[in-house]
């Protein structure tokens, strides 16, 4: 109440940029906190299917839009066939997970590995077997699976036949695919993510053309895609809530990614307003319909009136509250390259703690899973990834401060990524794994980097001990 009254803001995220130490929820003077995370804090690590599985056409897998995009748009990358070959070396992934001692493993299912043309008929047996074996092995190890249904690898057939996410026909097709996954894997999966970072799917897939399918320049398509992604997520949530939750007793969300931004002049109201616009145009675009009032943020509706689709009253009601927790991604993909439209002439910042505070204020202090966090190193860096450790310590410190000092309800943390792999438009020029993989080797051994040892220690101590 005090915060709202003093700042003049209506309790929304703009209060974060107020530098009055009495009223800003983030106390900058607390630079490092030696403390532990809450008991039973959920420690995990993640991968994306297209990034690590390899075997892009092996055992009946169909091509994805990214397989096609790699062959047509990315220079000097023949395929993801090299990658870390997780499809072949599943046991090596499991050993890596054992080494770190995580509570959960977040991975995605390759839609075209299960259904080569995207349509749910008879599943590809080898694909089904792969995911089933993985899940069984995780359960055996007491590692909770967090399963993402869509991490950007749309079956190419759906792109070619329907225009992909631009066409609302895909909403029902995605729901059919989700239903199949719930039916086949739901007995072993208690945490589901529908879509990973829809902002990047829409913005880079249809705006900049830097992601598959590589379309560019059509703002109406960008927001139509975003609209269909939100509606697809909502449909799947309702499906799970009605038909599967009663007996599977799991949780379902969508991973939303964002940058963070600071005003050029902290005392300047217009700069603060631009920072708010920046966050709203990236994170609010998807969070407001799902975690907020069921509609797009008002500023977006005004500014983008000619390209932003509308939700009917019934749809607003349907969208609202369709996430059981706030899954948040904070990593390089939302920073480089940053949409200049989103930057609003302000300064980008890696302050995860402030981003979490913004979410708290905007969306009524939800339970938060950090669903992707980490940084990257140059591809030449092997196992001595000191920068990655520095970044991890910094990020984890910010999460801990958010929990202990700001009373933000973060319940889990996903380090990204388990393995070096294919890094989207950056291909193999950067590495994000806690385990080093020599992509040119036959056996693709997973070698723990310094960051893997560091993360292992953090998990063992449940935080930072003096």
């Amino acid at each position: 109440i005090l915060l709202r009254a003093v700042t003049g803001f209506s309790g929304d995220g703009r209060a974060i940029w107020s530098k009055n130490p009495n009223f800003t929820p983030v106390n900058e003077s607390q630079l490092f906190l030696y403390d532990t995370f809450p008991k039973n804090f959920f420690w995990g690590i993640g991968t994306g299917a297209l990034q690590v599985e390899g075997s892009w056409k092996k055992d009946g897998k169909g091509p994805s839009i990214w397989d096609h995009f790699i062959h047509t748009h990315l220079k000097n990358v023949s395929s993801t066939n090299g990658s870390s070959d997780s499809y072949i070396f599943l046991e090596k992934d499991l050993s890596a997970l054992d080494f770190i001692g995580v509570s959960f493993y977040q991975f995605s299912i390759s839609w075209p590995r299960l259904f080569p043309d995207g349509i749910v008929t008879v599943a590809n047996a080898k694909g089904l077997q792969y995911y089933s074996t993985l899940l069984d092995a995780l359960v055996l190890r007491n590692i909770e699976p967090i399963v993402t249904l869509y991490h950007w690898d749309l079956p190419l057939a759906l792109q070619e036949k329907y225009g992909g996410w631009k066409n609302d026909t895909i909403i029902d097709i995605f729901n059919d695919y989700a239903t199949y996954c719930f039916q086949m894997f739901g007995d072993r999966v208690k945490y589901w993510i529908t879509i990973h970072n829809p902002y990047l799917v829409a913005w880079h897939g249809y705006g900049t053309g830097m992601h598959a399918p590589g379309e560019k320049g059509n703002l109406a398509a960008v927001y139509t895609v975003g609209h269909n992604l939100i509606k697809a997520h909502s449909k799947v949530w309702h499906n799970y809530n009605t038909h599967f939750r009663p007996h599977q007793k799991g949780w379902l969300s969508i991973t939303l990614g964002s940058h963070w931004i600071e005003p050029n002049r902290s005392e300047n109201t217009m700069d603060i307003f631009k920072c708010q616009q920046s966050m709203v145009s990236v994170l609010g675009w998807f969070a407001n319909p799902i975690h907020g009032d069921g509609d797009y943020p008002e500023g977006m509706r005004k500014k983008l009136f000619s390209v932003l689709p509308i939700f009917s009253e019934a749809e607003k009601h349907e969208m609202r509250g369709t996430a059981d927790f706030f899954a948040f991604s904070f990593g390089p993909n939302n920073f480089k390259p940053l949409n200049t439209m989103a930057k609003m002439g302000q300064n980008v910042s890696l302050n995860l703690r402030e981003a979490l505070n913004w979410i708290k204020l905007e969306y009524n202090n939800p339970r938060i899973l950090i669903a992707e966090n980490g940084w990257f190193t140059d591809s030449r860096v092997k196992t001595e990834d000191t920068t990655a450790i520095y970044m991890m310590k910094n990020f984890l410190s910010q999460v801990l401060q958010a929990i202990r000092l700001d009373e933000i309800r973060v319940f889990g943390y996903t380090a990204w990524s388990l393995l070096d792999g294919f890094e989207w438009q950056d291909a193999y020029t950067i590495r994000r794994g806690l385990f080093y993989v020599d992509f040119n080797s036959k056996q693709k051994e997973r070698k723990p980097k310094s960051s893997a040892h560091y993360y292992k220690q953090i998990i063992r101590e449940n935080g930072f001990s003096l």
Partner: antibody, heavy 123, light 110 residues
Amino acid sequence: QVQLQESGPGLVKPSETLSLTCTVSGDSVSSGDNYWSWIRQPPGKGLEWIGFMFYSGSTNYNPSLKSRVTISLHTSKNQFSLRLSSVTAADTAVYYCGRYRSDWDYYYGMDVWGQGTTVTVSS
Amino acid sequence: QSVLTQPPSVSAAPGQKVTISCSGSSSNIGNNYVSWYQQLPGTAPKLLIYDNNKRPSGIPDRFSGSKSGTSATLGITGLQTGDEADYYCGTWDSSLSAVVFGGGTKLTVL
């Protein structure tokens, strides 16, 4: 103060193409919050929106006129133009150019209008 | 046939109050923002109300706007003879992807 001024022929023959230009002063046609617009008003009738163009080059046109309309920006001259092909007597009207504006704060609508230019379609 | 529906005419005596209605649907007024325009005889239209209920500088507070559901209303109090004009409502229609106007309402000050 932002001002718009329409210019072009007052008489066009049926089946020909109507061409009008709008010169902008006090604002830039490459400004990000503006949609540069054309509206017309047939004699004794109401306003009819023809279409607009955003600085990025994206256009929206009245569905009933879409097949005949082209709006384009000329940033170097700070102008925008209208072309309406295959005109008939039904296209006789006062043609206005306008600035349609919306930003994060406010949805303004058509906040600046030109004075209008009368175009008659007749042989 | 206009997408937005306005009464063709309204009238009232000087000093009185008058309201002009504008009715639409969820794809236009219901989910977008309404502007009102005044067109004095022989002149170009002028923005009177924007963003449902805001007045541009120079527009007296005798003019007000409101919106409820799929309808909008323009109110004019303290009528003056100089208010005699045609009044148009306008908004964006998300289904048509077009700006739409009402048919116009002729205000006569008796």
